[in-house]
């Protein structure tokens, strides 16, 4: 239904707290360099204005669209051109072009310092002094670093943060209470960020149809007892919610997500038997819980997929009649039977099925042509299964850090032109798949591994798009989203690459490395490893292991030495010489 004042409607639906949080996220995701105070001021002005519209929907400007209202606010910021360069040109445009322009200027890798967590006492003091401002800072800092973070889900993480601080700041040992809990939230939030970015990429590059196909597969796996009409309705609603969030319409997105959660909870009987515990929770927790609810038990009497999609005499007629609906039912039927497959794999199978019908239905004897289609799925299914087995075996043998290093070597050989920080970040993220997925039961490994890898590789593609340097990466990133992971997996050593010359300073370290946290130490060592591979792309695993073991030994020795500086300055050059010899 149309509302006289869109801003009043959203304020009423969402309530002041969520309204303010979402407006802050929106502004922080659009203008990523502005300080918290600048954004907080704008948020307060927008909120005050919304309240006047709630009191009188006919008041001046209350009938304006949210894009117009928010865009006008952003464009009124002083020194916009000095701070944001050509983004200021967006302000010369009219809606909807102005909003599109803002979206195009979102930076997936803003040059902001890493978000450092203050020490426990300081954190608790500022939290107790002003919890609202404290949480505002959290929303601002996360949103500006992750400009596509799923806004209603960020509100959920802020709520988690709040609960942890409330609990731990009352403890005697605040540090040991806070650290593991906040680390857990951070890890989950980072995964949520790359997953959502993947959804927005799907929407931006391939449109709503592609996202809806993803949603149909995912929902069919989770709700195998829901019928196709129900799955289609949920997928349509979910597509709308994600389209809004990816498009910067965060108030509409959060409002529609709440509506979808309400609908699901009111229609549990036709959706799933597993929803009740989620539906008993308050809004943010409820929506989060529904998004990762366990799969319902599969119906016992599902007929073989071949009956309707291969053996039926009407296959080509049904396909001709309504291509998207027929392919949608295929995707639904296949997905509900295979919670053990990744969504990416299910979409590849649906694509293969579509291509087979396109070819076969144009032949004189289609049934003879498409009769073997299910057998042709076999290699497509085996490939990711082998990937999971190989990688989980390697992870179990090497542990997370060693597994990250193996991936780092592999990916540096595939794309040595990519910057070392990007390679290290990608390898560390890809390597976490082991900890995240390889410990799961067998039937959950494949979906976990492949869908997580796809999301991480999407980030690699986004960063590479900014400065394209590798033809290998460009090739894999140019194809469809579901083909990316197999494309990257199939890449081998880039034969066109001219090895980097050996620079001693790249492998020269100082005593300050000794005081770094373990994570930072690992990153330093992994940076050196990537540089070694760039110097010797065809070095054997054995050679690289020898050098890295030597390097680890050197760090251990010098960091324990009484005179660390002397140790580093005398033993360092010896290490460099040994490295050169080992790789010769």
């Amino acid at each position: 239904e149309a509302h006289k004042s869109e801003i009043a409607h959203r304020y009423n639906d969402l309530g002041e707290q969520h309204f303010k949080g979402l407006v802050l996220i929106a502004f922080s995701q659009y203008l990523q360099k502005c300080s918290y105070d600048e954004h907080a001021k704008l948020v307060q002005e927008v909120t005050d204005f919304a309240k006047t519209c709630v009191a009188d929907e006919s008041a001046a400007n209350c009938d304006k669209s949210l894009h117009t209202l928010f865009g006008d606010k952003l464009c009124a910021i002083p020194n916009l051109r000095e701070n944001y360069g050509e983004l200021a040109d967006c302000c010369t445009k009219q809606e909807p072009e102005r909003n599109e322009c803002f979206l195009q200027h979102k930076d997936d890798n803003p040059s902001l310092p890493p978000f450092e967590r203050p020490e426990a006492e300081a954190m608790c003091t500022s939290f107790k002094e002003n919890p609202t401002t404290f949480m505002g800072h959290y929303l601002h800092e996360v949103a500006r670093r992750h400009p596509y973070f799923y806004a209603p889900e960020l509100l959920y993480y802020a709520e988690q943060y709040n609960e942890i601080l409330t609990q731990c700041c009352a403890e005697a040992d605040k540090e040991s209470c806070l650290t593991p809990k906040l680390d857990g939230v951070k890890e989950k939030a980072l995964v949520s960020s790359v997953r959502q970015r993947m959804k927005c990429s799907s929407m931006q590059k391939f449109g709503e149809r592609a996202f809806k196909a993803w949603a149909v597969a995912r929902l069919s796996q989770t709700f195998p007892n829901a019928d196709f009409a129900e799955i289609t309705k949920l997928a349509t609603d979910l597509t709308k919610v994600n389209k809004e969030c990816c498009h910067g319409d965060l108030l509409e997105c959060a409002d529609d997500r709440a509506e979808l959660a309400k609908y699901m909870c009111e229609n549990q009987a036709t959706i799933s038997s597993k929803l009740q515990t989620c539906c008993d929770k308050p809004l943010l927790k409820k929506a989060h819980c529904l998004s990762e609810v366990e799969h319902d038990t599969m119906p016992a009497d599902l007929p073989a997929i071949a009956a309707d999609f291969v053996e039926d005499q009407e296959v080509c007629k049904n396909y001709a009649e309504a291509k998207d609906v027929f392919l949608g039912t295929f995707l639904y039927e296949y997905s509900r039977r295979h919670p053990d497959y990744s969504v990416s794999l299910l979409l590849r199978l649906a694509k293969k099925y579509e291509a087979t019908l396109e070819k076969c239905c144009a032949e004189a004897n289609p049934p003879a042509c498409y009769g073997t289609v299910l057998a042709e799925f076999q290699p497509l299914v085996e490939e990711p299964k082998n990937l999971v087995k190989t990688n989980c075996d390697l992870y179990e043998k090497l542990g997370e850090y060693g597994f990250q290093n193996a991936i780092l070597v592999r990916y540096t050989q595939k794309a040595p032109q990519v910057s070392t920080p990007t390679l290290v970040e990608a390898a560390r993220n890809l390597g976490r798949v082991g900890t995240k997925c390889c410990t799961l039961p067998e039937d959950q490994r494949l979906p976990c591994v492949e869908d997580y890898l796809s999301a991480i590789l999407n980030r690699v593609c986004l960063l590479h798009e900014k400065t394209p340097v590798s033809e290998h990466v460009t090739k894999c990133c140019s194809g469809s989203l579901v083909e990316r992971r197999p494309c990257f997996s199939a890449l081998t050593v880039d034969e066109t690459y001219v090895p980097k010359e050996f620079k001693a300073e790249t492998f020269t370290f100082h005593s300050d490395i000794c005081t770094l946290p373990e994570k930072e130490k690992q990153i330093k060592k992994q940076t050196a490893l990537a540089e070694l591979v760039k110097h010797k792309p065809k070095a054997t695993a054995e050679q690289l292991k020898t050098v890295m073991d030597d390097f680890a030994q050197f760090l251990d020795t010098c960091c324990k030495a009484a005179d660390k500086d002397t140790c580093f300055s005398t033993e360092g050059p010896n290490l460099v010489t040994r490295c050169k010899d080992a790789l010769a």
């Epitope: 005499q313 009407e314 296959v315 080509c316 007629k317 396909y319 001709a320 009649e321 396109e358 239905c361 144009a362 032949e363 004189a364 004897n365 289609p366 049934p367």
Partner: nanobody, 115 residues
Framework: EVQLLESGGGLVQPGGSLRLSCAAS????????ASWVRQAPGKGPEWVSS????????LYADSVKGRFTISRDNSKNTLYLQMNSLRPEDTAVYYC????????SSQGTLVTVSS
């Protein structure tokens, strides 16, 4: 929605000829193979002939081989069946179908071969 409309049937003497047409709409005609299927009174459907989407590939039942010719005009979204040397056993309702199916979503056209 797929729609198929057959025409051209009628009464013909043994040894005579008829040309059946089938006008198609509601889908991308050239992307689908098409067939003629017939059903004699009191019998099940019997496949007669098929043609690929491009028209380059054709198949015939043994009972009509050498007498019937299937063709199509993709610019007109129309399928044809040229029937020569007709016999009394060719008497049936003739249907056009999509993609090798034996389904009958259309009315069909009656062909009667009798002296």
């Amino acid at each position: 929605e797929v729609q198929l409309l057959e025409s051209g049937g009628g009464l013909v003497q043994p040894g005579g000829s008829l040309r059946l047409s089938c006008a198609a709409s509601g889908f991308t005609f050239r992307s689908f193979g098409a067939s003629w299927v017939r059903q004699a009174p009191g019998k099940g459907p019997e496949w007669v002939s098929s043609i690929s989407g491009s028209g380059s590939d054709t198949l015939y039942a043994d009972s009509v081989k050498g007498r019937f010719t299937i063709s199509r005009d993709n610019s007109k979204n129309t399928l044809y069946l040229q029937m020569n040397s007709l016999r009394p056993e060719d008497t049936a309702v003739y249907y056009c179908t999509i993609g090798g199916s034996l389904s009958r979503s259309s009315q069909g056209t009656l062909v009667t071969v009798s002296s």
